[in-house]
Interface confidence: medium
């Protein structure tokens, strides 16, 4: 039975040209995290594998940095970066947990962070 929950940074916003940290945290489970995928719609951004470490997809390597922790840092943001991001935790023996973050990249300097929320 999957008992874990993923806490994410929720709905967030950031300025065009700036950076943002995408963070997820898996709690309430003793399952071993074997891999974390970061994805945007159907595009794989990065993988953090327990054995291999980090791998950033070649098409994103100039604008994506690993960390902090299992999070992901997006740099040089553009309006096109607006959208849904998913952290996918591969765990054993539980299976897969998915967290969702919505990022809005703003033209103006008004960029407020949304509240944290949980996905069961």
């Amino acid at each position: 039975m999957m008992t874990g929950t993923i806490e994410t940074t929720g709905n967030i916003s950031a300025e065009k040209g700036g950076s943002i940290i995408l963070q997820c945290h898996l709690s309430s489970t003793t399952a071993q995290v074997t891999q974390v995928n970061w994805e945007q719609q159907d595009q794989l951004l990065a993988i953090c594998n327990a054995d291999l470490g980090w791998h950033i997809s070649p098409s994103f390597k100039d604008r994506v940095a690993p960390g902090p922790g299992l999070g992901l840092t997006l740099q040089s943001l553009t309006v096109n970066d607006t959208g849904e991001y998913f952290c996918i935790y591969h765990t054993y023996p539980d299976g897969t947990y998915t967290g969702r973050i919505f990022l809005e990249v703003l033209e103006s300097s008004v960029a407020e962070h949304g509240a944290r929320f949980q996905i069961p």
């Epitope: 891999q35 993988i47 054995d51 070649p58 098409s59 054993y92 299976g95 897969t96």
Partner: antibody, heavy 124, light 111 residues
């Protein structure tokens, strides 16, 4: 040392069954997706089936759907291929292979970095 | 008929540079999926040579390189050596077939 060792191949009559096994060692088996790839005599490599690290997601080539079944036992570090309703065209060397990642949402991206030596299946 | 098209054979002399092409379509090489290259000597386990279009696994000499453009990919081997004589396969996930597909393989001969 990362190692994959296939077994279970042999000679079988058309319509018969076989179960191939692949024993994994030297890496965390529960972290990675796995696949079976075959090579018929005088032909190239052909992917047959794949399975995610947890066993929840399975993928098959059209040519084997409904006849071949991939599974894994993570407690035994072993990958299986159950082969039913075998045909002459299934004659090949069957390789098991480890993917670079777990394979739930990323199976389509990452290739196979470790392969076994293969086991021969002859349908005749 | 393979989904990915490779020349059946290629050859070169020691020290030469050889290129092997791999042609696909918009549903495999032309998508956001990646191309992988394998080296296979008959009777042995296939070996991953290049992954994610152009990345070399540790232990693979930098004489091997690869690139992708549009619906085609290519593998280049510089400073050809006798031990490079083998079959080379390109591979990618095909979205239309929902399957990993391989090229027909290219037999490289070192003269």
């Amino acid at each position: 040392e990362v190692q994959l060792l296939e077994s279970g191949g042999g000679l079988v009559q058309p319509g018969g069954s076989l179960r191939l096994s692949c024993a994994a060692s030297g890496f965390t088996f529960t972290t990675y997706a796995m696949s079976w790839v075959r090579q018929a005599p005088g032909k190239g490599l052909e992917w047959v089936a794949g399975i995610s690290y947890i066993g929840s997601d399975k993928y098959y080539a059209d040519s084997v759907k409904g006849r071949l079944t991939i599974s894994r036992d993570n407690s035994k570090n072993t990958l299986y291929l159950q082969m039913d309703s075998l045909r002459a065209e299934d004659t090949a060397v069957y390789y098991c292979a480890k993917h670079l990642t777990g394979g739930t949402t990323d199976y389509y991206y990452y290739g196979m970095d470790v392969w076994g030596q293969g086991t021969t299946v002859t349908v005749s | 008929q393979s989904v990915l098209t490779q020349p059946p054979s290629a050859s070169g002399t020691p020290g030469q540079r050889v290129t092997i092409s791999c042609s696909g379509s918009t549903s495999n090489i032309g998508t956001s999926r990646y191309v992988h290259w394998y080296q296979h000597l008959p009777g042995t386990a296939p070996k991953l040579l290049i992954y994610l279009d152009s990345q070399r696994p540790s232990g693979v000499p930098d004489r091997f390189s690869a690139s992708k453009s549009g619906t085609s990919a290519s593998l280049a081997i510089s400073g050809l050596q006798s031990e490079d004589e083998a079959d080379y396969y390109c591979s990618a996930w095909d979205d239309s077939l929902s399957a990993w597909v391989f090229g027909g393989g290219t037999k490289l001969t070192v003269l």
